[in-house]
């Protein structure tokens, strides 16, 4: 670099350096300038920080005319405001440990960085920044309408939501439904909920629907066969009337149940479907409610616990009627 | 980094009980449910059984009567019992982490013979 | 008994296009399945690729797809490369428990 020449100064007043950029002069003496940080670009006109131990490395003697800023062995390292040694490692947060190594920081994440795709588990999991912890964990988000747990969640456990179906996808409106929630009654006439917005505003509405899981006036361990342990589906002998608040169906149902075991097992409806039933009530008025029909019954061993509903029996789904929720509401 | 292991026995007689052990790293036992999948030799994989980030479990009902899964958040260990082994059985055991089977172990070769 | 059903072999050229399908004997295939598919290529370990239909873990390329597709899961591999040669498992959820599918051997010539 040519010094020789007078000293020109693109400003007369001394440049801002950004914090924790030192203003030093120029290679001729004559001007004052940021100094050039680790790794960048720099010339006699434009040297290095000095007092982050950084050099302008001009590589081989060819090349004379720029350089990269170097640090020298040992230099020590500005960080956040603060000078850590060469060697030193330090938290420059909960979240990160960084080490000083010849005048270059190197910061490793001490969170996760994790992923989580959908389970049956997990069906919407996001991360969140809880109280009191440095780094965000994975939470499974559930229907806003789950918040009460009460005597409806006795028999069975929760029922998961079910992530966006891109064949679903309308205009403007991502079409969700939850899974049906199971049955308010282990046996008796109960009630079972989602949470969709397929409807014509997409606006979040709670469908509900009748179901009765078994009749509690059935003697079933009595069908249950020699030698075996359970029965999953027994047969209902003749067609049944349901009633509700004393109002009778006004039609007769051959309708499935889920059986009882004897070996400690339980038995949920597996696979379900919904259709409407007609009521006639004592006064003459006809009611239409959406009933619960189960096609099939599972037995397993995942029963309620006393003490936490959840423990068992939060991942076994009643697999309902969700590819067609869209047909009868 | 994520990573699970596999441990237990390399041969087993019939009729004795596999013991498998898979130890987590990377990641929380509360937070995440852990799978066990087999594989017997040259045949395709077979879902076993899984315990939920909740401590909950399920089975594949195949083997129902004779597997038990268990966990250990503390030491970050997923514990499978299979009763009554039988050659049938011989396969290599995984252990994979719930939430798209994304991480998977190496897994452990079982043999049963008398 | 419920039987997920793979292609057993696909062959593709490189930079072509192949779908991988899994079909569920017990009717169509739901996003309540949760369809997972999972890769091994030869001498690795598993990893999963896709999870909750169409959702890609990380190291998954964006030349993987997963979908619902005539009321079966599928894979589609656009543009594949030639690294994308894999045993490919898909796995679903029934309510209680996973079936695997018998896997599907994807060759990718040259």
């Known amino acids: 670099q040519d010094c020789s020449a007078q000293c020109q100064c693109a400003a007369e007043a001394a440049p801002h350096c950004p914090a924790g950029v030192s203003l030093v002069l120029d290679g001729c003496g004559c001007c004052r300038v940021c100094a050039k940080q680790l790794g960048e670009l720099c010339t006699e006109r434009d040297p290095c920080d000095p007092h982050k131990g950084l050099f302008c490395d001009f590589g081989s003697p060819a090349n004379r005319k720029i350089g990269v800023c170097t640090a020298k062995d040992g230099a020590p390292c500005v960080f956040g405001g603060s000078v850590y040694r060469s060697g030193e490692s330090f938290q420059s947060s909960c979240k990160y440990q960084c080490t000083c190594l010849d005048g270059a920081v190197g910061c490793v994440p001490l969170c996760s960085m994790d992923v989580r795709l959908p389970s049956p588990d997990c069906p919407f999991p996001r991360r969140v920044k809880l109280p009191g912890k440095c780094c965000e964990e994975w939470v499974c988000d559930e229907p806003k309408d789950r918040t009460a747990v009460g005597p409806a969640l006795a028999a069975y456990r929760l029922e998961d939501t079910f992530g966006p179906d891109p064949t679903m996808m309308r205009a403007n409106c991502l079409v969700q439904t939850t899974e049906w929630s199971a049955c308010s009654k282990t046996c008796g006439m109960g009630i079972s909920t989602r949470v969709t917005n397929d409807n014509t505003f997409c606006r979040l509405e709670k469908q509900s629907r009748l179901c009765m899981v078994r009749p509690c006036e059935a003697d079933l361990e009595e069908n249950i066969k020699k030698g075996k342990k359970c029965i999953r589906t027994p047969k209902i002998a003749k067609p049944v009337k349901f009633e509700l608040s004393g109002c009778t169906s006004v039609k007769t149902y051959r309708a499935k149940f889920c059986g009882v075991c004897t070996d400690g097992r339980c038995c949920t409806p597996h696979r379900t479907t919904t259709l409407p039933v007609e009521f006639k009530c004592p006064d003459g008025e006809i009611m239409k409610k959406n009933m619960m029909f189960i096609k099939t019954c599972a037995c397993h061993y995942n029963c309620p616990g006393d003490n936490d509903i959840f423990e068992s029996l939060y991942y076994r789904k009643m697999y309902g009627d969700m590819a067609h929720h869209h047909h009868h509401h | 980094e994520v990573t699970l292991k596999e441990s237990g026995p390399v041969l087993v007689k019939p009729t004795e009980t596999l013991t498998l052990t898979c130890t987590v790293s990377?990641?929380?036992?509360?937070?995440?449910?852990v799978h066990w999948i087999r594989q017997p030799p040259g045949k395709a994989l077979e879902w076993l059984a899984v315990i939920w980030r909740r401590g909950g479990t399920d089975y594949n009902a195949a083997f129902m009567s004779r597997l038990t899964i268990s966990k250990d958040t503390s030491k970050s260990q997923v514990v499978l019992t299979m009763t009554n082994m039988d050659p049938v059985d011989t396969a290599t055991y995984y252990c994979a982490r719930d939430g798209g089977f994304d991480y998977w172990g190496q897994g452990t070769t079982v043999t049963v013979s008398s | 008994e419920t039987v997920v059903t793979q292609e057993p072999s696909l062959t593709v050229s490189p930079g072509g296009t192949v779908t991988l399908t899994c079909r569920s004997s017990i009717g169509a295939v739901t996003t309540s399945n949760y369809a997972n598919w999972v890769q091994q290529k030869p001498g690795q370990a598993f990893r999963g690729l896709i999870g909750g239909t169409s959702n890609r873990a990380p190291w998954t390329p964006a030349r993987f797809s997963g979908s619902l597709l005539g009321g079966k899961a599928a894979l589609t591999l656009s543009g594949v490369q030639p690294e994308d040669e894999a045993e490919y498992y898909c796995a679903l959820w029934y309510s209680t428990h996973y079936v695997f599918g018998g896997g599907t051997k994807l060759t990718v010539l040259g």
């Open positions: 990377g990641f929380s036992l509360s937070t995440f449910g």
